[in-house]
Interface confidence: low
Amino acid sequence: AELFLIASPSHPTEGSPVTLTCKMPFLQSSDAQFQFCFFRDTRALGPGWSSSPKLQIAAMWKEDTGSYWCEAQTMASKVLRSRRSQINVHRVPVADVSLETQPPGGQVMEGDRLVLICSVAMGTGDITFLWYKGAVGLNLQSKTQRSLTAEYEIPSVRESDAEQYYCVAENGYGPSPSGLVSITVRIPVSRPILMLRAPRAQAAVEDVLELHCEALRGSPPILYWFYHEDITLGSRSAPSGGGASFNLSLTEEHSGNYSCEANNGLGAQRSEAVTLNFTVPTGARSNHLTS
């Protein structure tokens, strides 16, 4: 009796399953009790001897390329051996490499975590991923793994991490680079300082009081809100950073606490309150403000 080894599929792609079948064309295996064993080169595969004429291999890799055969043994200890079959495992070269960021869009707050995710649309086997900083290419890290994506993490982003990044994927067919991704580091506003500026030391009713609010740190644009007690007076924008001012024509109702808030979309910070009180100087006919 003759024995054949059939691999299905016969030309597998890396990562895909393969079924090996040990066939006896002129003998029904049910006619006699057989045990089967599958080999690659000189090594037995799977469970060794088994009553099943099939062996399922869950995933084939490039290194599984080789010469396979099977043996069948009867109860009478007669051993049949198949001819060798060459199985070539096909590797798919990496293609369509892309670099994405988490958070998306490449905008990240100072101190936050930034993840650079390198992905390939196709590619099999062990893929080496490499991350580079700057168009010139300072190598940051490399990882080799059997997956289509890999991550490089900056746990706490600093201002100096604002740069262009790219990644390269390679699985034996030459490196394939991604496009450049720009990282913008957004800096939250610091607590603003509110200054009250009047045309004279003792501001009087109808004087123009300037409320100047400034956050010393923070990515522009910065929106400043001005408050009297809990009431919004208005807002001013500082498109390029720096401070902003709000003018008030003074009346008696302007006594009380003033504060301002700076907001650049990364959370808001409120200033300490500045208290403005009316005082009536002895012998004076008009009210004056003191802060």
């Epitope: 009297h228 007690e229 809990d230 009431i231 919004t232 007076l233 208005g234 008030l248 024509s249 009346t251 109702e253 302007h254 808030e261 907001n263 979309g265 959370g267 808001a268 910070q269 409120r270």
Partner: antibody, heavy 117, light 112 residues
Framework: QVQLVQSGAEVKKPGASVKVSCKAS????????MHWVKQAPGQGLEWIGR????????KYNEKFKSKATITVDKSTSTAYMELSSLRSEDTAVYYC??????????WGQGTLVTVSS | DIVMTQSPDSLAVSLGERATMNCKSS????????????LAWYQQKPGQSPKLLIY???TRESGVPDRFSGSGSGTDFTLTISSLQAEDVAIYYC????????FGQGTKVEIK
Amino acid sequence: QVQLVQSGAEVKKPGASVKVSCKASGYTFTRYWMHWVKQAPGQGLEWIGRIDPNSGGSKYNEKFKSKATITVDKSTSTAYMELSSLRSEDTAVYYCTRVNSGAMDYWGQGTLVTVSS
Amino acid sequence: DIVMTQSPDSLAVSLGERATMNCKSSQSLLYSSNQKNYLAWYQQKPGQSPKLLIYWASTRESGVPDRFSGSGSGTDFTLTISSLQAEDVAIYYCQQYSNYPTFGQGTKVEIK
């Protein structure tokens, strides 16, 4: 979209305390102050107090100063109001509400607190 | 505290007719520095949370039908529903935010 989701109804005995939560989503929690409003059964709306989630600073209606304590947890974008020494007149629906330039533009669904022996 | 007084307490209007309600504050709500009136109007339907309709006395909140309008300045304010719809049955509250917030007692709007 902006959402304020409050904790469920509570039944408490006189003298007990209750803590109502209000989880905010869909906006930057620290940008907007959060107010709490009481509505007794069949009655109108009464302001309890407010908190600035950014600084944690709070202010109260004089009437509720010894009754309510408002706090926030910035990490979970949640505001809380604790009512202490509960009495039958504290039975009401309590709302959290976000304030935008003074006006209360988004409201929670309300939490009914029933005080009964 | 600023006291807000609404009138009438209840109002019955036919569908498609105009509904007008008033709100009076014990102090002026007009803030001289920005010429804004610190007053809002809310609608509360049975079993629901209040909903902001109008702020700055006359600015309609996004998504609010244009049949709702607010007017007035200083201490006297009006909310008008130009053509009452069945879904407008509710209690309407005015609220000042010139100081720590206070609400009017509400005006109940029903269909005649």
